[in-house]
């Protein structure tokens, strides 16, 4: 287990989350990148529900961020932002347990 | 295949309680980023957005009628309710529930919707 | 509350022409929190309940056909029917939910000239 890479080992736990499995399954509207507009503004983990990652791709030139808070409301997050580069790099040493906040890739259509 | 049906009385006098119930399939309230709503359409009037509850049962209220409305989720049955207090001839409408879940975001619209029950206010 | 005010009320189109239904908000719909503009289309086909077109200004539902196109800026907000279809009639709504307590336009009854 120790020769997996740990980006596969996080590919892997993304799609056996069990509480919010298959959420992003549904549908898929549009090749298209979907935030309007980044924050670098830190976002503390007690306020999120959810981080989605959505890499390069579709119709999308950029890599997407985008995390969905508690109060029910969805912030696009700068890829670059350091806090989130941290709590990415957090999740993925964390990758071999369970993940506090679930992560999500884009769904290939 | 999503459905989603509202049940209740047809006829309620005023002051009266009125209780909805929605009753849906095809999709699970515990999943992450479900939503019901309850929408009604008075007869030639414009819809109207009553209530919505989330998965984690967060709720949200039209405030003009806040005081007068209660919406509660059965995960276990696939059932949302609404109750609505101190019923007047002027809540006469069609009651719809809708679902809505989003892939990017909490709010991408309500995609399905029910067939809409008719209640009538009158002594 | 945002007021939703839709023109032209009624609407007569031949088939295989365009159509655009104009909706206008009483305040901005976008989200200055996240840039987002909710603002969502829906249909009510005759007999039929709503279905929704379009959400977030300009997204396509799932299997909506890709005549319907919606668009706009801040509180003035278009939807076109590239080329109406016999099966396009009915009553079209604009919606917004950027701000509680969520609201409709009073509708737009597209028919068949």
């Known amino acids: 287990m120790k020769f997996i890479s740990t980006s596969l080992l996080l590919m892997l736990l993304v799609s056996s989350l069990s509480p919010v499995q298959g959420v992003l399954e549904v549908y898929y509207t549009s090749l298209r990148c979907r935030c309007v507009q980044e924050s670098s503004v830190f976002i503390p983990r007690r306020f999120i529900d959810r981080i989605q990652i959505l890499p390069r791709g579709n119709g999308c030139p950029r890599k997407e961020i985008i995390v969905w808070k508690k109060n029910k409301s969805i912030v696009c997050v700068d890829p670059q932002a350091e806090w989130i580069q941290r709590m990415m790099e957090v999740l993925r040493k964390r990758s071999s347990s369970t993940l506090p906040v679930p992560v999500f890739k884009r769904k290939i259509p | 295949q999503i459905t989603l049906k509202e049940s209740g009385p047809t006829l309620v006098k005023p002051t009266q309680t009125l209780t909805l119930t929605c009753t849906f399939s095809?999709?699970?309230?515990?999943?992450?980023?479900?939503?019901v709503g309850w929408i009604r359409q008075p007869p030639g009037k414009a819809l109207e957005w009553l209530a919505l509850i989330y998965w984690d049962d967060d709720k949200r209220y039209n405030p003009s009628l806040r005081s007068r409305l209660t919406i509660t989720k059965d995960t276990s049955k696939n059932q949302v309710v609404l109750t609505m207090t101190n019923m007047d001839p002027v809540d006469t409408a069609t009651y719809y529930c809708?679902?809505?879940?989003?892939?990017?975001?909490?709010?991408?619209?309500?995609?399905?919707w029910g067939q809409g029950t008719t209640v009538t206010v009158s002594s | 509350d945002v007021v939703m005010t839709q023109t032209p009320l009624s609407l007569p189109v031949t088939p295989g022409e365009p159509a655009s239904i104009s909706c206008r908000s009483s305040q901005s719909l976008l989200d200055s929190y996240n840039g987002n503009t909710y603002l969502a289309w829906y249909l009510r086909k005759p007999g039929q309940s709503p279905q929704l077109l379009i959400y977030?200004?300009?997204y396509r539902a799932s299997g909506v056909p890709d005549r319907f196109s919606g668009s706009g800026s801040g509180t003035d907000f278009t939807l076109k029917i590239s080329r109406v279809e016999a099966e396009d009639v009915g009553v079209y709504y604009c919606?917004?939910?950027?701000?509680?307590?969520?609201?409709f336009g009073q509708g737009t009854k597209l028919e068949i000239k």
């Open positions: 095809g999709f699970s309230l515990s999943t992450f980023g479900a939503t």
């Open positions: 809708a679902r809505r879940l989003g892939q990017y975001d909490y709010d991408e619209g309500f995609d399905y």
């Open positions: 977030r200004l300009s």
């Open positions: 919606s917004q939910s950027t701000h509680v307590p969520y609201t």
